[in-house]
């Protein structure tokens, strides 16, 4: 039975040209995390494998930095980066847990972090 929950940074906003940290945290399970995938729509941004470390997809190599922790830092943000991001935790023996973050990239300097929320 899958008992874990994923806590994410929720709905967040950031300024064009700036950077943002996408963070997810898996709790309430003793399952072993084998890999975490970060995705935007149907594009893989990065993989963090428990044994091998980080792989950043070629399309994002210039603008994505691994960490902190299992999180991901997006740099040189553009308005086109607005959208849904997903952290997919591959665990054993539970299976897959998915968290969702919505990022809005703003032209002005009114960007501020939204509230944290949980996905069961």
């Amino acid at each position: 039975m899958m008992t874990g929950t994923i806590e994410t940074t929720g709905n967040i906003s950031a300024e064009k040209g700036g950077s943002i940290i996408l963070q997810c945290h898996l709790s309430s399970t003793t399952a072993q995390v084998t890999q975490v995938n970060w995705e935007q729509q149907d594009q893989l941004l990065a993989i963090c494998n428990a044994d091998l470390g980080w792989h950043i997809s070629p399309s994002f190599k210039d603008r994505v930095a691994p960490g902190p922790g299992l999180g991901l830092t997006l740099q040189s943000l553009t308005v086109n980066d607005t959208g849904e991001y997903f952290c997919i935790y591959h665990t054993y023996p539970d299976g897959t847990y998915t968290g969702r973050i919505f990022l809005e990239v703003l032209e002005s300097s009114v960007a501020e972090h939204g509230a944290r929320f949980q996905i069961p």
């Epitope: 084998t34 995938n37 149907d42 594009q43 044994d51 091998l52």
Partner: antibody
């Protein structure tokens, strides 16, 4: 250039253990990469068996978990496959291959070694 | 485990033709797909990673496309030396799995 070379017995009896060695030249197995074993059955189907990481952490295909062990000898720059309780279903060509985190795909392969399980 | 299905075991083509090989994943794999070429008596060789990126030194007639569950590998103009078996592989989640292979043959 990275080169991998498999070696080991070509014939193994049912219920015995299969032991293979992969010797790596041109790169240290402790520097980076996942060092994999992959087998190809008669009829061409490929199966990823498992890897040992550059740090020495093994990871196995759950379908083989109770029978497989991947270890290494860093002084000889070699890694090993042991598969226990073999049956005729384990007859295959066995490849070692490296996977780098730049590409996350098997970029260097050995030439393969054929193993027949038969009494 | 994620099953990668290559629906055609064989594909018949002529030198100079454009040919496309398909691969379908049993569940979402984003663009975490590689393609390999295996010539008779040789080990597989990496051609494409990240669904659409050519590996170092791979000719530009080899093209990969797709995302999610549906992937296509195309040779824009088949050469005699391209006759081989082609495999897709997913690395979205462990265990990494391969398609059954598609053998390219001359008509």
């Amino acid at each position: 250039d990275v080169q991998l070379q498999e070696s080991g017995p070509g014939l193994v009896k049912p219920s015995q253990s299969l032991s293979l060695t992969c010797t790596v030249t041109g790169y240290s197995i402790t520097s980076d990469y996942a060092w994999n074993w992959i087998r190809q059955f008669p009829g061409n189907r490929l199966e990823w068996m498992g890897y040992i990481s550059y740090s020495g952490a093994p990871r196995y295909n759950p379908s083989l978990k109770s029978r497989i062990s991947i270890t290494r000898d860093t002084s000889k720059n070699q890694f090993f496959l042991q598969l226990s309780f073999v049956t005729t279903e384990d007859t295959a060509t066995y490849y070692c291959a490296s996977l780098g985190t730049d590409y996350y795909a098997m970029d260097y392969w050995g030439q393969g070694t054929s193993v027949i399980v038969s009494s | 485990d994620i099953v990668m299905t290559q629906s055609h075991k064989f594909m018949f083509t002529s030198v100079g033709d454009r040919v496309s090989i398909t691969c379908k994943a049993s569940q979402h794999v984003s663009n975490a797909v590689a393609w390999y070429q295996q010539k008779p008596g040789q080990s597989p060789k990496l051609l494409i990673h990240s669904a659409s990126y050519r590996y170092t030194g791979v000719p530009d007639r080899f093209i990969g496309r797709g995302s999610g569950t549906d992937f296509t590998f195309t040779i824009s103009s088949v050469q005699a030396e391209d006759l081989a078996v082609y495999y897709c592989q997913q690395y979205y989640s462990l265990p990494w799995t391969f398609g059954g292979g598609t053998k390219l043959e001359i008509k």
